[in-house]
Amino acid sequence: LQDLCSNCPAGTFCDNNRSQICSPCPPNSFSSAGGQRTCDICRQCKGVFKTRKECSSTSNAECDCISGYHCLGAECSMCEQDCKQGQELTKKGCKDCCFGTFNDQKRGICRPWTNCSLDGKSVLVNGTKERDVVCGPSPADLSPGASSATPPAPAREPGHSPQ
């Protein structure tokens, strides 16, 4: 004998209390596939989460993070505090990037400035806490015969405190 529950479409559940009638999922629950004997409880976007997509009878709710936070993990399973550009999040909160590193986003870690000399180039624009250095032509390209619209800015000397 065929199981009548297999006829129940997504958005419903097979209600054994009512002779295997397909009943619609109650509010705040869903079934994404047919033939289910129960509906799944919808995710609730509370606290640092906010609702990006309300739960429907066939699909779960989707969450975002409230202002000042950003999503981490699959399906925004966590919210992490934003920092300012030029900072990174540590266990003690947002901290300025150390000299020689930068972060141009509100999330993530401070990364070292590009080492222009590794590519045989010179520093055209100094790095900051918020921006990477800009590499320019190699010193050889800047011989007296070569024209250069912008002379290279001098590299920052080590030991200077962050701006």
Epitope: P26, P27, E54, T58, S59
Partner: antibody
Framework: QVQLQQSGAELTRPGASVKLSCKAS????????IQWIKQRPGQGLEWIGT????????RYTQKFKGKATLTADKSSSTAYMQLSSLASEDSAVYYC??????????WGQGTTLTVSS | DILLTQSPAILSVSPGERVSFSCRAS??????IHWYQQRTNGSPRLLIK???ESISGIPSRFSGSGSGTDFTLTINSVESEDIADYYC?????????FGGGTKLEMK
């Protein structure tokens, strides 16, 4: 910002049908339930039904099954409610509202329907 | 269907008083109750969701409590701008429904 703009006042004859609209803006239309609510003069709020625009899923209260038909046009981000076989007791203000499960955070300004011969 | 009963139908208060609105469900609905305010000739606005959760932009004098079948909306110090009708709505089961409302008046 989120807005629900409802169609203008309607004056219709008994027995006729009318289609009220609710144009959504400022958010992803398909992501939230749209509720429809009736309020007769001097009376309370009466829930008619709701539609989920993404898949057209609808729910009605028993009283309005056969009276109200909810639809949604994703291309224009507009929800509609058609009311049929109109009678004087259908004269009311009709509201659309965005959101259901966490309450209706946003409401339209309401459409006044007058049914008179 | 779940029936929501609001009481009293009319509440008369003086400015600065603490006032409570009752909403009773005919069967248990967990915390799936939401409260709305409707001023004269205006659209309703959401005050409280899920019985006790605050809504951004709503003054802190509004609070909610309760679970199961008995719910309360409280205004801890009424102001003249609070004169309005107040409604509860359940979203625990289909069809969702509103209570009959309570009118808040000034003495």
């Amino acid at each position: 910002q989120v807005q629900l703009q409802q169609s203008g006042a309607e004056l219709t004859r008994p027995g006729a049908s009318v289609k009220l609209s609710c144009k959504a803006s400022g958010y992803t239309f398909t992501n939230y339930w749209i509720q429809w609510i009736k309020q007769r003069p001097g009376q309370g709020l009466e829930w008619i039904g709701t539609i989920y625009p993404e898949n057209g899923d609808t729910r009605y209260t028993q009283k309005f099954k056969g009276k109200a038909t909810l639809t949604a046009d994703k291309s224009s981000s507009t929800a509609y409610m058609q009311l049929s076989s109109l009678a004087s007791e259908d004269s009311a203000v009709y509201y659309c509202a965005r959101g259901l499960l966490e309450g209706a955070h946003y409401w339209g300004q309401g459409t006044t329907l007058t049914v008179s011969s | 269907d779940i029936l929501l009963t609001q009481s009293p139908a009319i509440l008369s208060v003086s400015p600065g008083e603490r006032v409570s609105f009752s909403c009773r469900a005919s069967q248990s609905i967990g915390a799936s109750i939401h409260w709305y305010q409707q001023r004269t000739n205006g659209s309703p606005r959401l005050l409280i969701k899920f019985s006790s959760e605050s809504i951004s932009g709503i003054p802190s004098r509004f609070s909610g409590s309760g679970s199961g079948t008995d719910f309360t909306l409280t205004i801890n110090s009424v102001e003249s701008e609070d004169i309005a009708d107040y409604y509860c709505q359940q979203t625990n089961s289909w069809p969702t429904a509103f209570g009959g409302g309570t009118k808040l008046e000034m003495k």
